[in-house]
C-alpha cells in the first residue's frame, strides 16, 4: 500500500479540477499544491467538493498562509468559509465591501455564526466606523444586526448611515440602544418636512424624550399604539391627557386595551381623574379629585 | 428552522418518468447543496444526486443515466426527475440537506411514497 | 448489496449496552472520510444521531456514542431503553462514486 503521507505515482493535481472529488481524503492532502490552490481559488466553487473535502483544501491554505490568508484568496472562498474558525477570521484585514457580501451570501438562510460576527467586527474595525453602504450590507442580510451591537458600538454609526435603516431592523433593538439611535436619526431626518419625518422617525421613537414628544403632539401625526408602547415610560409620564389625545388622534381609543400595560399604566397614574374623564374611555386608576400632586423629583432636582 | 415538504405523483407508469419537487421553507435554497436520498420499502437508504447553490449536479454513478436534478431559486424549490422507470423504483423518496458545514444530513423532508406499477 | 456493511439486526435487554458495526474499503472510511449514524423510527424520516465519526447533534442524548478506525466503525449504545428501538444506518463518502454510500441499516430490537 502506498505511504499516506506521499501522492501515488500519477496523481499530482496539475490544475483544480473536477477530477479531484475523486481523491481520497489523504490523496487530496497529498497531491494537491497550497500554492497551486491559492491561484486557483476561483474554481474551487465551480467544482462540486464535500464540505469534508473542503476542510481538506482549507488546511492547504493554512499552511501556505500561517499568518492569515490574503485578500485575493479570501474573495474566493465561497463556501469554504464555512470552515473558517473565529480565530483564523481574526488574522484577516478584509476591506473590500463586495468580498464582505461573497461571504455573508455564503452564510445566508442560516443565523449569524460566531464566524460571520466575527468577520463583521474585523471588517468594521477596519473601516473605522459603521457607514450607510456597510449598514445597507449587513442590514439586508442580518435584519437584526443593528440591535445586536452594543450601545457603545452604536455610538460609531454615523447619522448619515441611518437612512439605511429599515423598520424591521431595529424590532429586537431595547431602550438603551435606541436612546443612541434617535437622535442620530433626529438628526438624520431634520430637513424632512412633518408627515415625511414622522414616517422615518417612528421607528427610533423608543429613544425620544419628552420633550420631542410634546413637539410631535403640536404636528397631527396619529402616532399607533404599538409605537406609544414603546415609548420610554420616563418620557411618557411628564404628557398630559390633551398632549397625548393629540399624539395618538384617533387611535387614543387603543389606550383603553392597554390600561394594565406600561407605559399606559403608569401615565394614568400620574394623570388626574378629571382630565382622563374627558377622553371617555373609561380609564381609571387617575388622581382623585381635590388631591394635591407634589413632584417630588423636582423638589431633589432643586435642593 | 428550515423545513423540506417532498410533493409529486404517487403512482407511475412502468417506463415513465418519475418528477418529484422538494420545497424550502424557513430558509434560503443557497445552501451549499442539497440532496435526493430513497429507500426501497423494508431496505435500506440511497443516494440519488445532489445539487450545488450555483446549479452544479453530481448523481449515483448507478442512476446517473436517468436522473436530472435542478433548482429554481425563485420557488425555494428543487427537483427530480428518473426516466424509464420500473417496479425496482418503487420507494419513499427523501429530500435532504446537511448540517452547516458538514456532510451529514440534519434535515430531512418527512417523505413520499412513489409506486411504479401499470 | 450496500457499500458499506452492518449487522441486519441486534438486541439488549433494557439498561445494556450495544454495539452497532459499519464497515467500508479503502475508497469510504479507509480513504478518511468521516462516518455519520442515523435513527430511523418506523414510518418516519431518519435522524441524524452522530456526524464526524463521535459528535452528538444538540438533543441527542450521551447514551450515543461513534467511534473510527481504519475501515470501519461503530455506534455505541449505553443504558438501552424501548425508545431506541429502531433502524441504525452510517454512512460515508466513497471516493470512487464521489457520492455519499450508506450501510444496509441494522434493526435494534429491545427485549
Known amino acids: 500500500e502506498v505511504e499516506k503521507t506521499a501522492c501515488p505515482s500519477g496523481k499530482k493535481a496539475r490544475e483544480i479540477d473536477e477530477s479531484l472529488i475523486f481523491y481520497k481524503k489523504w490523496e487530496l492532502e497529498a497531491c494537491v499544491d497550497a500554492a497551486l490552490l491559492a491561484t486557483q481559488m476561483d474554481r474551487v466553487n465551480a467544482i462540486p467538493f464535500t464540505y469534508e473535502q473542503l476542510d481538506v483544501l482549507k488546511h492547504k491554505l493554512d499552511e501556505l498562509y500561517p499568518q492569515g490568508y490574503p485578500e485575493s484568496v479570501i474573495q474566493h472562498l465561497g463556501y469554504l468559509f464555512l470552515k473558517m474558525s473565529p480565530e483564523d477570521i481574526r488574522k484577516w484585514n478584509v476591506t473590500s465591501l463586495e468580498t464582505l457580501k461573497a461571504l455573508l451570501e455564503v452564510n445566508k438562510g442560516h443565523e449569524m455564526s460566531p464566524q460571520v460576527a466575527t468577520l463583521i467586527d474585523r471588517f468594521v474595525k477596519g473601516r473605522g466606523q459603521l457607514d450607510k453602504d456597510t449598514l445597507d450590507t449587513l442590514t439586508a442580510f442580518y435584519p437584526g444586526y443593528l440591535c445586536s451591537l452594543s450601545p457603545e458600538e452604536l455610538s460609531s454609526v454615523p447619522p448619515s448611515s441611518i437612512w439605511a435603516v429599515r423598520p424591521q431592523d431595529l424590532d429586537t433593538c431595547d431602550p438603551r440602544q435606541l436612546d443612541v439611535l434617535y437622535p442620530k436619526a433626529r438628526l438624520a431626518f431634520q430637513n424632512m418636512n412633518g408627515s415625511e419625518y414622522f414616517v422615518k422617525i417612528q421607528s427610533f421613537l423608543g429613544g425620544a424624550p419628552t420633550e420631542d414628544l410634546k413637539a410631535l403632539s403640536q404636528q397631527n401625526v396619529s402616532m399607533d399604539l404599538a409605537t406609544f408602547m414603546k415609548l420610554r415610560t420616563d418620557a411618557v409620564l411628564p404628557l398630559t391627557v390633551a398632549e397625548v389625545q393629540k399624539l395618538l388622534g384617533p387611535h387614543v381609543e387603543g389606550l383603553k386595551a392597554e390600561e394594565r400595560h406600561r407605559p399606559v399604566r403608569d401615565w394614568i397614574l400620574r394623570q388626574r381623574q378629571d382630565d382622563l374623564d374627558t377622553l371617555g374611555l373609561g380609564l381609571q386608576g387617575g388622581i382623585p379629585n381635590g388631591y394635591l400632586v407634589l413632584d417630588l423629583s423636582m423638589q431633589e432636582a432643586l435642593s | 428552522q428550515v423545513q423540506l415538504q417532498e410533493s409529486g405523483p404517487g403512482l407511475v407508469k412502468p417506463s415513465e418518468t418519475l418528477s418529484l419537487t422538494c420545497t424550502v421553507s424557513g430558509g434560503s435554497i443557497s445552501s451549499y447543496y442539497w440532496n435526493w436520498i430513497r429507500q426501497p420499502p423494508g431496505k435500506g437508504l440511497e443516494w440519488i444526486g445532489r445539487i450545488y447553490y450555483n446549479g452544479n449536479t453530481y448523481y449515483n454513478p448507478s442512476l446517473k443515466s436517468r436522473v436530472t436534478i435542478s433548482g429554481d431559486t425563485s420557488k425555494n424549490q428543487f427537483s427530480l426527475k428518473l426516466s424509464s422507470v420500473t417496479a425496482a423504483d418503487t420507494a419513499v423518496y427523501y429530500c435532504?440537506?446537511?448540517?452547516?458545514?458538514?456532510?451529514?444530513?440534519?434535515?430531512w423532508g418527512q417523505g413520499t411514497m412513489v409506486t411504479v406499477s401499470s | 448489496q450496500s457499500v458499506l456493511t452492518q449487522p441486519p439486526s441486534v438486541s439488549g435487554a433494557p439498561g445494556q449496552r450495544v454495539t452497532i458495526s459499519c464497515t467500508g474499503s479503502?475508497?469510504?472510511?479507509?480513504?478518511?472520510?468521516?462516518v455519520h449514524w442515523y435513527q430511523q423510527l418506523p414510518g418516519t424520516a431518519p435522524k441524524l444521531l452522530i456526524y464526524g465519526n463521535s459528535n452528538r447533534p444538540s438533543g441527542v442524548p450521551d447514551r450515543f456514542s461513534g467511534s473510527k478506525s481504519g475501515t470501519s466503525a461503530s455506534l455505541a449504545i449505553t443504558g438501552l431503553q424501548a425508545e431506541d428501538e429502531a433502524d441504525y444506518y452510517c454512512?460515508?463518502?466513497?471516493?470512487?462514486?464521489?457520492?455519499?454510500?450508506f450501510g444496509g441499516g441494522t434493526k435494534l430490537t429491545v427485549l
Open positions: 454512512q460515508s463518502y466513497d471516493s470512487s462514486l464521489s457520492g455519499w454510500v
Open positions: 479503502s475508497s469510504n472510511i479507509g480513504a478518511g472520510y468521516d
Open positions: 435532504a440537506r446537511p448540517k452547516l458545514g458538514i456532510d451529514a444530513f440534519d434535515i
